[in-house]
Structures are given as structure tokens and as C-alpha cells.
């Protein structure tokens, strides 16, 4: 691959030679998911 990441799904996408755009989409959607998860946790 062309680099490394602490996110397994991003690591896989690098192995699959994904574009910077698709990696960015994955990273941003993961962040959105985490924010939503923390929001749900905080509202319990």
C-alpha cells in the first residue's frame, strides 16, 4: 500500500488503491458516525 492508518477500513482502501477522494469520504463519514455515537451516548 501507499501508507498507513489507524483506521482499518482506510488501510484496506489503500491496499485497493482507492482515490484520495474516496479515502476522504470514508474518513469524514467515520467522523460523522463517531460524533453521532457520542451524541447518543451523551443523551442517555
Amino acid at each position: 500500500g501507499g501508507g498507513g492508518s489507524k483506521h482499518k477500513c482506510v488501510q484496506n482502501s489503500l491496499v485497493n488503491n482507492e482515490t484520495l477522494e474516496s479515502i476522504m469520504n470514508t474518513l469524514e463519514s467515520e467522523e460523522d458516525f463517531r460524533k453521532y455515537f457520542y451524541y447518543l451516548e451523551g443523551s442517555k
Partner: antibody, heavy 121, light 107 residues
Framework: EVQLVQSGPGLVKSSETLSLKCTVS??????????WGWIRQPPGKGLEWIGS???????FYNPSLKSRVTISVDTSKSQFSLRLTSVTAADTSVYFC?????????????WGQGTTVTVSS | DIQMTQSPSSVSASVGDRVTITCRSS??????LVWYQQKPGKAPKVLIY???RLQSGVPSRFSGSGSGTDFTLTISSLQPEDFATYYC?????????FGGGTKLEIK
């Protein structure tokens, strides 16, 4: 207007570690849609990408340097950093930090001023 | 890795000339191609992104074309301030890679 200001020593001893920082002003390092990267340019030569980081901390490195490079981000200080270990004379270069994102098809639209790093024996 | 081959490596031209620089990628990169201008002692500056989109503030004498593996930067009428080194860069996938550069010199 986003600006990048680089800091760090211009002289590093052979076999030691090069450390540089890049501080983002006039905007947020946490803005969505950007990678923050490091590029270097040996004297009289072309541009070489070292690596990039996303605000999440996910990193992407040049395979030729991967074993020696660490890039990290500190969103609270609006900074990202480069560490290059076990330097040799071949690492003597001008080092630039930069931002690349969706707005410009991932071209580096904002650059730091450049830091000339000389590796001495 | 995607290799970027830029040609020529240097070119001598006069003010008013039309100059064309080419860049070829070893794999299809669609339009994920950026052109930079660099002057001595300065950081590179984006001229063209997305293969053909002109960066704000860049004179219209600069244009970019191409898609896939073959790309061109054209300066329609050279001005004194255009004498510099030009680089292409693929922004399709990591690792990011640059062409070797084209030094544009005064004839």
C-alpha cells in the same frame, strides 16, 4: 485567509531526528475535506511528497520514507508535525508543509514558507 | 505508485512565445492532475487543478487540458514573470507523486 507557518531547526546532526512543526492560522485545522501534508525538495532538485495526515489522525506516508517518518496532528494547538529519524546527508532539503483538499482537487493550495534543513556530520 | 513523466525537462523561449509542457501518468488518473509554478526560493503555487481548472488569480494565458494519462499545460503568450519551473502532480491516489519539473528559461 489560511496561512501555514513552519518552525523547527535548520541544522540536524547525522543519525539524529529532524522535527518540524506547521501552525495553521486564519482557519481551522479541523475543517472538513482536507489533508495536511509535508513535501521536501533537495537542493536543485524536484518535489517529493513525504506524507499527509487527516484531522482524525489518519496518516499516509511515502513508502520510501515510511520506516523513518511520523506525522502527527494537535488540533487543540492547530498544529501538525513531522518527525524524520536517522537522518543522513540525503535528507538535506527544503521542507514545506501544505494543505490539500477537495476545493482544489487535492492540489496543495496553501504552503508554508519552507524550512531549509541541513544534515551535518 | 503512479509515475509522472514530464517533458521537456527544460525549454528556452522568448516573451510572447506559446509554450506547451506535457505530463504523462503511468496509470489512469482521470482528471486528478495539478500544475504548479515555482520560483527560486519560494514555495510552489497552484496554477491549474482538476487538469483544466484555472486557479483564482492566475492569468488566463495559462490553460490545462487532458484526462486519463496525458496532460498538457499551455502558456499562450509568455510574459517575463512566467520564467520559472513548472511541476505536475497526480492527486488521484497515495503516494502523491510529482513530475520531474520543467525549467522555463529566457532564450
Amino acid at each position: 485567509e489560511v496561512q501555514l507557518v513552519q518552525s523547527g531547526p535548520g541544522l540536524v546532526k547525522s543519525s539524529e531526528t529532524l522535527s518540524l512543526k506547521c501552525t495553521v492560522s486564519g482557519g481551522s485545522i479541523s475543517s472538513s475535506g482536507y489533508y495536511w501534508g509535508w513535501i521536501r525538495q533537495p537542493p536543485g532538485k524536484g518535489l517529493e511528497w513525504i506524507g499527509s495526515i487527516h484531522r482524525s489522525g489518519s496518516t499516509f506516508y511515502n513508502p520510501s520514507l515510511k520506516s523513518r517518518v511520523t506525522i502527527s496532528v494537535d488540533t487543540s494547538k492547530s498544529q501538525f508535525s513531522l518527525r524524520l529519524t536517522s537522518v543522513t546527508a540525503a535528507d538535506t532539503s527544503v521542507y514545506f508543509c501544505g494543505r490539500h483538499g477537495r476545493d482544489y482537487y487535492y492540489g496543495m493550495d496553501v504552503w508554508g514558507q519552507g524550512t531549509t534543513v541541513t544534515v551535518s556530520s | 505508485d503512479i509515475q509522472m513523466t514530464q517533458s521537456p525537462s527544460s525549454v528556452s523561449a522568448s516573451v510572447g512565445d506559446r509554450v506547451t509542457i506535457t505530463c504523462r501518468s503511468s496509470q489512469d488518473i482521470n482528471n486528478w492532475l495539478v500544475w504548479y509554478q515555482q520560483k527560486p526560493g519560494k514555495a510552489p503555487k497552484v496554477l491549474i487543478y482538476g487538469a483544466s481548472r484555472l486557479q483564482s488569480g492566475v492569468p488566463s494565458r495559462f490553460s490545462g487540458s487532458g484526462s486519463g494519462t496525458d496532460f498538457t499545460l499551455t502558456i499562450s503568450s509568455l510574459q517575463p514573470e512566467d520564467f520559472a519551473t513548472y511541476y505536475c502532480q497526480q492527486a488521484n491516489s497515495f503516494p502523491l507523486t510529482f513530475g520531474g519539473g520543467t525549467k522555463l528559461e529566457i532564450k
